[in-house]
């Protein structure tokens, strides 16, 4: 049978040939009658065999990491017979390892993110090096990890390559660290090979900083003419955190006047001071408000960093605006009796300059020929007034600052002209009546009514009478209906168209004013020729009357 020991050949041997071992048959008596042959991958190129002795030689430098074993076949032939002495057999040549490979970090580049302020022992990342040497052969591939750069913030577990935090870090001081890790084989013993890698460790932000006002005092100004909602200025706090952790909300901590508000611009993280109520320089010319700022999002476990909100004081100066004069009342109503003489007193309007300088005021009346106003605001008449022409006057009074004529205010002034009894009552219309020649006594000829241009304080009451002459000699009589109307009746039987075709009756109408006024009104009565029924008028003056547009019915 075949006789051999296990074959080993060290890698990386520089000699031209290296004796590996010897193959032989136990039938070989050493008389050189056997011929040994080597077959398989590497036979003849990497390994050769001494055909006579069976000694195997490596003729090439070997690299275990390229190929760690060779499987070859051996044959032995009897030269004399040419027949195989032993059956062909497979054998193995193992390439034995030397420490010719340094550890390599294959997953580079390494990058890790860890929250700032993480406690000691927090796992950051695990780095792993590979050593191509034989892990089963001694310590050639047994690695130890160590930290070359990154103390005192980081540490590495020597056997696992796990990087941990060894000291708390503040992102606001330094936001990233380069850590250099070394891996050594031979468990660090002499002759060890090493490899290094860099790890970029970035600190993610936690909300460990509250926003703080850099300015303890802000000074803003607001015009007293500014409408509510006006932005009067901005304030700004700074937060060393980033992103969501730097988002902040501004609010008013103290403003007894409740005149201002603060809204947050979430894009710029500024506080905008807003006018909530209109200000008046003459009432209050400066304001003080205290503003505070807080983070928008704060985790419960980070509340210790946010106990006391940062505050700032804002001094707001109100800017004076020259305002127009201010009338004491929004409008005035005055009364004056009609027929009072020119220059009569109507009333007084009053306006003042609301500004601090208290400019004198000048008054004027827009487009009025009837009234005048002086610099004291006293309104007088320039003409006698007639209520029956105009009972009310709507005036526009203008007040102008003496020192700034552009500052103008106007208000309406209503003047009521009060009635005096200066008009007697009179016929409400023109009356023209007729009476039939054959009319009997007591026949109603006409109902009359009166009007009075004066205003009635309670109700007008008119009194109707015939004139003294007509009362004594009249063919007609009058009855007062006590309702501001009266009826004219015949006072005799029969009239003669030829003798007396027209009667002119003077009617006295008196009012109930104090003193009472009376007017004399003439009623014209035509005598007509009527048929028996009294309905057909064949009146001498009928055509005349009709052409004038009068009806006689």
């Amino acid at each position: 049978g075949w006789v051999w020991n296990q074959f080993f050949v060290p890698e990386e041997m520089n000699t031209t040939s290296h004796h590996v071992g010897r193959l032989r048959s136990d039938l070989d008596n050493g008389n050189n009658s056997f011929q040994y042959k080597l077959l398989g991958a590497g036979a003849g190129s990497t390994f050769i065999i001494d055909e006579r002795t069976g000694d195997i030689y490596a003729i090439e430098k070997l690299d275990r990491e390229e190929r760690s074993l060779y499987i070859l076949r051996a044959q032995v032939i009897d030269i004399t017979t040419g027949r195989a002495v032993e059956p062909e057999s497979e054998f193995v040549i193992k390439v034995s390892d030397i420490n010719d490979n340094e550890p390599k970090f294959l997953d580079e580049p390494y990058e890790a993110i860890v929250p700032e302020m993480s406690p000691e022992g927090t796992l950051v990342i695990q780095v792993t090096a590979s050593d191509a040497d034989d892990p089963s052969s001694g310590n050639n591939a047994r690695l130890l990890y160590s930290l070359l750069q990154g103390q005192p913030y980081f540490s590495v577990e020597p056997t696992t390559g796990v990087i941990r935090i060894s000291s708390k870090m503040d992102r606001e001081l330094q936001d990233e660290y380069w850590v250099i890790i070394q891996a050594k084989d031979m468990i660090g013993q002499p002759g060890a090979l090493s490899g290094t890698t860099s790890v970029l460790i970035k600190l993610s932000d936690v909300n460990d900083n509250k926003p703080i006002f850099k300015e303890s005092l802000y000074r803003l100004t607001v015009s007293e003419s500014a409408p509510t909602g006006t932005s009067i200025g901005t304030i700004m706090a700074y937060d060393n955190d980033i992103g969501e952790n730097a988002e902040m909300d501004y609010s008013i901590e103290e403003d007894d006047s409740q005149t201002f508000d603060i809204i947050t611009n979430h894009e710029t993280q500024e506080g905008i001071v807003i006018l909530k109520k209109k200000v008046n320089f003459e009432h209050q010319n400066h304001y003080g408000i205290r503003a505070k700022v807080k983070n928008h999002h704060v985790d419960e476990q980070l509340m210790k960093y946010h106990t006391e909100a940062s505050t700032t004081f804002i001094k707001i100066q109100v800017e004076d605006v020259d305002e127009p004069p201010l009338f004491l009342l929004p409008y005035y109503i005055f009364e004056i009796f009609e027929e009072t003489p020119q220059g009569s007193f109507v009333g007084v309007v009053s306006a003042t300059d609301p500004d601090n300088r208290k400019s004198p005021i000048r008054y004027s009346i827009t487009r009025s020929k009837v009234f005048n106003i002086d610099d004291n605001g006293t309104i007088t008449t320039t003409n006698s007034l007639d209520r029956e022409i105009s009972a009310w006057y709507n005036l526009s009074i203008t007040a102008t600052e003496k020192y700034n004529i552009e500052q103008i205010s106007s208000i309406p002034v209503y003047v009521q002209v009060l009635n005096i009894n200066d008009h007697a009552p009179e016929f409400s219309q023109y009356y023209e009546s007729y009476v039939c020649e054959n009319a009997g006594s007591g026949q109603v000829i006409q109902t009359i009514s009166a009007v009075d241009r004066d205003e009635s304080i309670e109700e007008h009451h008119f009194y109707f009478n015939l004139s003294v002459e007509d009362t004594n000699s009249s063919s007609f009589t009058i009855i007062d209906n006590q309702d501001n109307t009266a009826v004219i009746l015949t006072n005799r039987t029969g009239f003669n168209l030829q003798e007396e075709p027209i009667f002119y009756i003077s009617i006295l109408i008196a009012d109930n004013g104090i003193p009472s006024l009376t007017s004399t009104n003439t009623l014209t009565i035509h005598v007509c020729d009527c048929d028996d029924s009294g309905s057909t008028q064949t009146c001498q003056y009928q055509e005349l009357m009709l052409s004038m547009g009068f009806k006689t019915e």
Epitope: S216, L217, R219, T221, D256, S257, E282, H283, Q284, N285, H286, Y287, G288, F313, K315, Q317, E319
Partner: antibody, heavy 119, light 107 residues
């Protein structure tokens, strides 16, 4: 320490002019609003004028409006009061005062300078 | 303008006694914008109280201020010899006006 020292007072005839100065030290002059206050002999205090920290705003009491002008020179740390058309009733000790940073009261006063207006 | 009226005009007290000075405003003083000063003869006024009740720097705690709206008071809990002076209230809600003063004299 904060110091305010007034100067420029004296006797002046009615209708004439006078300029008072107030030298400030011991604080950041440009950060504070400054005032003038006067006190007639044997009488109480009367506020006269104020100028804002940056000199952009001035306000006056009605009694001096149009006649007095308040100003400041930050490079010299000095406050001024220019008094024109002086009247007998302007006779008083004139004090300059610093307005509190977080308030409108007067936390520091000078010792005052006397202005006498008489013919 | 806001008119301040102080009372009494003169207060005669002995050292160690309690002094209460009153200041009344003609209209409400916003945000308690009221200060108290004292003035010794020949000296400049000195700020005692601001914001109606806050003591100024270096002012002893025997001085206290109170009030709001239109009625304010300055109390000196126990008069010291150096406290005998003229006391002025001042409003700074709208412009600046002073009261006419209260003289605290030794009885």
């Amino acid at each position: 320490q904060v110091q305010l020292v007034e100067s420029g007072g004296g006797v002046v005839q009615p209708g004439r002019s006078l300029r008072l100065s107030c030298a400030a030290s011991g604080f950041t002059f440009s950060s504070y609003d400054m005032h003038w206050v006067r006190q007639a002999p044997g009488k109480g205090l009367e506020w006269v004028a104020v100028i804002s920290y940056d000199g952009t705003n001035e306000y006056y009491a009605d009694s001096v409006k149009g006649r007095f002008t308040i100003s400041r020179d930050t490079s010299k740390n000095t406050l001024y009061l220019q008094m024109n058309s002086l009247r007998a009733e302007d006779t008083a000790v004139y004090y300059c005062a610093r307005e509190r940073y977080f308030d409108w009261s007067f936390d520091y006063w000078g010792q005052g300078t006397l202005v006498s207006v008489s013919s | 303008e806001i008119v301040l009226t102080q009372s009494p005009g003169t207060l005669s007290l002995s050292p160690g006694e309690r002094a209460t000075l009153s200041c009344r405003a003609s209209q409400s003083v916003s945000n308690t914008y009221l200060a108290w000063y004292h003035q010794r003869p020949g000296q400049a006024p000195r700020l005692l109280i601001y914001g109606a009740s806050s003591r100024a720097t270096g002012i002893p705690d025997r001085f206290s201020g109170s009030g709001s709206g239109t009625d304010f008071a300055l109390t000196i809990s126990s008069l010291e010899p150096e406290d005998f002076a003229v006391y002025y209230c001042q409003q700074y809600s709208n412009s600046w006006t002073f009261g006419q003063g209260t003289k605290v004299e030794i009885k």
